[in-house]
């Protein structure tokens, strides 16, 4: 199946490429540079999946969340872990698989009857087929109780950035996540020097907007490493 195209030789601790770079002569598949696929075996099972280091849930797949692989492990070492199914323990919404949310430490179905405060609807609209989603998975969208079919506005509780309206991202605020504005040119941004440092933030900033990247402000180059100010700047 589609979700089983994996790579048992993926280099650990490097972000997996999202697409193959420059195809090799005579090959129909563009493979990532430095990555070799096992002879004749394009499709592999999820068991061969290599851990992907992450700083936040949004860097993982839609059926994963970002966390330390060991209970009480080093907060600085986080990888993408498989989402938790219904009735499994959780600490936040993103830990639960699509179609579920975290309630009282347990993943429960996102049934509107149970979820009144921040209605989360299970949308089974398929990308390609009106009646089904891939492997029966449904898309989860956090919706405000006032407007059923609009994306979350600034301040709305969210699970992921795709729950928020255009120009907003889903970022941590205390111990929940809300829709916050994507950063504009000149605004202060957070540049994480080591993977996993996102997990330490209780007031998380959004990423920089389109065409911008988070870089050291020019007049702060001389400052010490710890006090360097990063702002969103044009590429």
């Amino acid at each position: 199946t589609l979700n089983s195209v994996l790579n048992s030789n993926a280099i650990k601790n490097l972000p997996p490429p999202l697409g193959g770079a420059a195809g090799h002569p005579g090959s129909a598949v563009s493979a990532a540079p430095g990555i070799l696929y096992p002879g004749g075996n394009k499709y592999q099972t999820i068991d061969n999946y290599q851990p992907y280091p992450c700083a936040e849930d949004e860097e993982c797949g839609t059926d994963e969340y970002c966390a330390s692989p060991t209970r009480g492990g080093d907060a600085g070492v986080q990888i993408c872990l498989a989402c938790r199914k219904r009735r499994k323990r959780c600490m936040r919404h993103a830990m639960c698989c699509p179609g579920n949310y975290c309630k009282n430490g347990i993943c429960v179905s996102s049934d509107q009857n149970h979820f009144r405060g921040e209605i989360e609807e299970t949308i089974t609209e398929s990308f390609g087929n009106d009646h089904s989603t891939l492997d029966g998975y449904s898309r989860r969208t956090t919706l405000s109780s006032k407007m059923y079919h609009t994306k979350g506005q600034e301040g709305s509780v969210c699970l992921r950035s795709s729950d928020c309206a255009s120009g907003l991202c889903c970022a941590r605020h205390f111990w929940s996540k809300i829709c916050k504005p994507v950063l504009k040119e000149g605004q202060v941004c957070t540049k994480h020097r080591r993977k996993g440092s996102h997990g330490l933030e209780i007031f998380q900033r959004c990423y920089c907007g389109e065409g911008l990247s988070c870089r050291i402000q020019k007049d702060h180059h001389q400052a010490s490493n710890s006090s360097r100010l990063h702002t969103c700047q044009r590429h």
């Epitope: 972000p15 860097e59 390609g128 898309r139």
Partner: nanobody, 125 residues
Framework: EVQLVESGGGLVQAGDSLRLSCTAS????????VGWFRQAPGKEREFVTA????????DYADSVKGRFTISRNNAENTAYLQMNSLKFEDTAVYYC??????????????????WGQGTQVTVSS
């Protein structure tokens, strides 16, 4: 049937900029990885860039790093490819593609199950 529609292609001079758009039908766009591929005359289709479902992860071919920027707007079911400092070698038909993004992993063209018809980009020197 899913439809991906590319737009924004055209004829430009070397050094100019161009912005391609890829508009998708269907709400599952926000759960998919979106990639741009290109095919120059007489050459194989090659990977250009891709962006994961949330926009938090991007990947670029070495030949376009620092010049091209991929972004997406899930609310509008659209992905963008901003191409700056265009070179003659960038001349190709550019294809937008999408596929499910359930796990963070290495992707190949096989992961991209929906493809657009392509838009021609011609860079004159």
């Amino acid at each position: 049937e899913v439809q991906l529609v590319e737009s924004g292609g055209g004829l430009v001079q070397a050094g100019d900029s161009l912005r391609l758009s890829c508009t998708a039908s269907g709400s599952a766009f926000s759960r998919s990885v979106v990639g741009w591929f290109r095919q120059a005359p007489g050459k194989e289709r090659e990977f250009v860039t891709a962006i994961n479902w949330s926009g938090a992860r991007t990947d670029y071919a070495d030949s376009v790093k620092g010049r091209f920027t991929i972004s997406r707007n899930n609310a509008e079911n659209t992905a963008y490819l901003q191409m700056n400092s265009l070179k003659f070698e960038d001349t190709a038909v550019y294809y937008c593609a999408a596929g499910w993004d359930r796990y963070a992993r290495v992707l190949t063209e096989y992961d991209y199950v929906w493809w657009g018809q392509g838009t021609q980009v011609t860079v004159s020197s």
